[in-house]
């Protein structure tokens, strides 16, 4: 299996809610021997491998951010340590799972890793991340909207419907 | 921050049976994949079992197999180790730790110590 | 089994000098290699995580380095509270493994 980053980079204004999303892709196995921990963090970009530093989030660790699941289960963080940080992570059927930040600082900006370890009976691990950037922006040239480029071009994608404003 | 202490350790002849208890503090143990590792006295660390947060599965080190039997209560938060059929060379320290996937033990009690003589 | 073998088995360093510490294993690894400080009468406490990175509260006088089969850890300058039992362990394949440890001294 392949862990694939739908949108590598996330460009915000502050005050905004955003999900950074990454997607389970490839032959999942779901079997009763086989089970996923998937998890995130922040990192940077290091020399030798990107996402090989585990760096909290908003000072929730990894294994605070941990969903636990078979294949394609669905499973949400239901800890109240994560939303009291106003953060989520959730998982669907579908093989995508997600880290939702609410009310995004500057401080929030740097690289990001979703962490996927395929958990078999009798094996050795198998360990898959992928990354993507959060550019969280202020003042006058900071977008309206979250701004997201996908992956594969730097064709940049407007995010509006799903994410809104944080409001106090 | 979660705390893991262990008990139940003791002297026991060979043949004997104990049974530790590694008590975790905190609301988060049913997501804890913990290992069982021992140290004999002046010597090094060895792995001894694992177990996941769900319970399933469960490995032995081979010169535990057939005699330790690893076993978890959620409710309880609390983690034991059943040993049977004990030898002078499994007189340790035991340390229960955490072992999450793709990650290190990096969480562990202080330990408790199992003596094995006649 | 992975098998990892530990050198020198014995350090004797000063306060203030450099220590290198070894760790190869009998097959790859990959880069899956945790170092370990175990002081008297303590539990070990996690100190290097996927062969290179430190583990949260590390100094930065400690590195290390490798992948594969050979690993290495270095304390830039040792400080009194560095004088202790140091292993590798390795998590690429069952059974866990851990090296047989280094015992820092103090010379």
């Known amino acids: 299996f392949k862990v694939a980053t739908p949108y590598s980079l996330y460009v915000c204004p502050e005050g905004q809610n955003v999900t950074l999303t990454c997607r389970l892709l490839g032959p999942v196995d779901k079997g009763h021997d086989v089970t996923f921990y998937k998890t995130w963090y922040r990192s940077s970009r290091g020399e030798v491998q990107t996402c090989s530093e585990r760096r909290p989030i908003r000072n929730l660790t990894f294994q605070d951010l941990h969903l636990h699941h078979g294949g394609h289960q669905a499973a949400n963080t239901s800890h109240d340590l994560a939303q009291r940080h106003g953060l989520e992570s959730a998982s669907d059927h579908h093989g995508n799972f997600s880290i939702t930040m609410r009310n995004l600082t500057l401080l929030d900006s740097g690289l990001y890793c979703c962490l996927v370890v395929e958990i078999r009976h009798h094996h050795s691990e198998h360990r898959v991340h992928g990354a993507m950037e959060l550019q969280v922006q202020t003042g006058k040239d900071a977008p309206s909207n979250c701004v997201v480029y996908p992956s594969s071009s730097q064709e940049s994608e407007n995010i509006t419907a799903h994410h809104h404003h944080h409001h106090h | 921050q979660v705390q893991l202490v262990e008990s139940g350790g003791g002297l026991v002849k060979p043949g004997g049976s104990l049974r530790l208890s590694c008590a975790a503090s905190?609301?988060?143990?049913?997501?804890?994949?913990m290992s069982w590792i021992r140290q004999a006295p002046g010597k090094g660390l060895e792995w001894v079992s694992y177990?996941?947060?769900?319970?399933?599965?469960?490995y032995y080190a081979d010169s535990v197999k057939g005699r330790f039997t690893i076993s978890r209560d959620n409710a309880k938060n609390s983690l034991y180790l059943q040993m049977n059929s004990l030898r002078a060379e499994d007189t340790a320290v035991y340390y229960c730790?955490?072992?999450?996937?793709?990650?290190?033990?990096?969480?562990w009690g202080r330990g408790t110590l199992v003596t094995v003589s006649s | 089994e992975i098998v990892l073998t530990q050198s020198p088995a014995t350090l004797s360093l000063s306060p203030g000098e450099r220590a290198t510490l070894s760790c190869r294993a009998s097959?790859?690894?990959?880069?899956?290699l945790a170092w370990y400080q175990q002081k008297p009468g303590q539990a070990p406490r996690l100190l290097i995580y996927?062969?290179?990175n430190r583990a949260t509260g590390i100094p930065a006088r400690f590195s290390a380095s490798g992948s594969g089969t050979d690993f290495t850890l270095t304390i830039s300058s040792l400080e009194p509270e560095d004088f202790a039992v140091y292993y590798c362990?390795?998590?690429?394949?069952?059974?866990?493994?851990f090296g047989q440890g280094t015992k820092v001294e103090i010379k």
């Open positions: 177990i996941s947060n769900s319970g399933s599965p469960i």
């Open positions: 730790a955490r072992d999450l996937p793709g990650w290190y033990f990096d969480l």
């Open positions: 905190g609301e988060t143990f049913s997501d804890y994949y």
């Open positions: 362990q390795q998590r690429n394949n069952w059974p866990r493994t």
């Open positions: 996927d062969a290179s």
């Open positions: 097959q790859s690894v990959s880069s899956y």
